[in-house]
Interface confidence: medium
């Protein structure tokens, strides 16, 4: 069965997506399975359907049950089931297991805790974060978009993290909370925001017209195994492969260097038969990984050949 478990707390907003997907143009009908009663689409109702979404604004314990969604297209119908459970708010701080979303892990140099289900809601910053019911304070904690970043993670940072945000529906505000566990892994390797060793930012490289020129983009990403990292060149903001100039090609450096245990990559840009118009281009060395993207820009300038006349 196309069934999905969803849960929430009474007096909070809960939005559930139909487990069956369809194009935005398809209509979706929702029913309360126990009574086969159609869920209204009018937004004045506390519980209403809005396309693929079923909205409880706010939720009540009595809303618990199985809801059926039928995605209707001109050629077929698809049926899904949302098993919704609304719980009473706990008087104490403990969050029971049945209210917990999936556990995430972090390490000393890398930690991100995403707020579960937040993409279903119409929310605006700030996103509030709590650990074991205490509001997080201090410069080590940064709420960024829909996730929390913890700097210099320690084993003591393990615990239950709750995100709290406000869902807005037609000018009315509803609170939403979601909790997940965070565990800390002790790892020797780490990854960090890319560091470009060469070229220097805004470097000017002298080249001779008619000769060949090489530019090397070199960056390091951390220590040990690196996950989804790359260096590459762009010309005027365009990938080399898309730029369409066969004289200008990039090729991977000989190997990944691990000097001092650092994981680094080289990418060489080869320009054959340098032309005047090459001096007008902007050459960007890009280094990227899951932490982000760093860019160093290089421009070429004409190197005058040595005059041998006496």
């Amino acid at each position: 069965k196309f069934s999905k478990q969803s849960w929430g707390l009474e007096n909070e907003a809960l939005i559930v997506r139909c487990p069956r997907q369809g194009k935005p143009s398809y209509t979706v009908d929702w029913y309360y399975s126990q009574t086969n009663k159609s869920i209204p689409t009018q937004e004045r109702n506390r519980v209403f359907a809005s396309g693929q979404l079923l909205k409880f604004l706010p939720a009540a314990v009595a809303d618990s049950g199985i809801y059926t969604c039928i995605v209707r297209s001109p050629t077929f119908n698809r049926t899904g089931y949302a098993n919704v459970t609304i719980y009473k708010k706990q008087s104490d701080c403990n969050v029971p297991d049945y209210l917990m979303y999936s556990t995430v892990s972090g390490s000393e140099k890398n930690s991100k805790i995403y707020c579960p289900t937040i993409d279903l809601y119409n929310w605006t910053a700030p996103l509030e974060w709590f650990k074991n019911c205490q509001a997080l304070q201090g410069s080590r904690y940064r709420a960024h978009k829909s996730f929390l970043v913890i700097d210099n993670v320690m084993t003591e940072d393990a615990g239950d993290y709750t995100c709290k945000f406000i869902h807005n529906e037609n000018g009315a505000n509803y609170s939403v909370t979601a909790t997940r566990s965070f565990t800390v892994k002790d790892e020797q390797g780490f990854s960090l925001f890319p560091v470009i060793g060469a070229p220097a930012q805004n470097e000017i490289k002298e080249v001779e017209i008619g000769k060949n020129a090489n530019l090397t983009c070199s960056a390091c990403f951390g220590k040990g195994t690196q996950f989804l990292a790359a260096v590459l060149w762009q010309l005027n903001g365009t990938k080399i492969t898309d730029f369409g100039e066969p004289r200008i090609q990039q090729e991977e450096g000989q190997n990944q260097s691990f000097s001092n245990g650092l994981a680094c990559l080289d990418m060489v840009l080869r320009i054959a038969d340098v032309k005047e118009e090459d001096l007008l281009l902007q050459y960007d060395c890009l280094a990227l990984n899951l932490h982000g993207l760093r860019r160093h820009t290089v421009r070429l300038s004409r190197k005058n050949p040595i005059d041998h006349h006496s």
Epitope: T225, Q226, L228, A230, Q256, A263
Partner: nanobody
Framework: ESGGGSVQAGGSLRLSCAAS???????MGWFRQAPGKEREGVAM??????DYADSVKGRFSISRDSAKNTLYLQMNSLKPEDTGMYYC?????????????????WGQGTQVTVSS
Amino acid sequence: ESGGGSVQAGGSLRLSCAASGYTINYRMGWFRQAPGKEREGVAMASAISEDYADSVKGRFSISRDSAKNTLYLQMNSLKPEDTGMYYCAAGRVWGRLWNPDDYNSWGQGTQVTVSS
């Protein structure tokens, strides 16, 4: 890879792929091969993007955990035609996304069987 198995149509599975050794993976992805068919791309991830084959869009979700150096493939609403051996692969970010030849490191594969 891990997480494969047998499941009824409409069920879910989550595949995991852990990258190890002193490597830098530029792009990682999931490919599958059904009996008697060519290996085909299912979902790809780089540092800044995700791509899905049309046949799995809206049902499969690729995610990555840089702390664990692990790539995941969450497969929901599985269909019998999703049956096959699923492989995790690492390749170059500037390569052709869906071409197996541009992926230079491969896992041993995990079998996914979806019955109706």
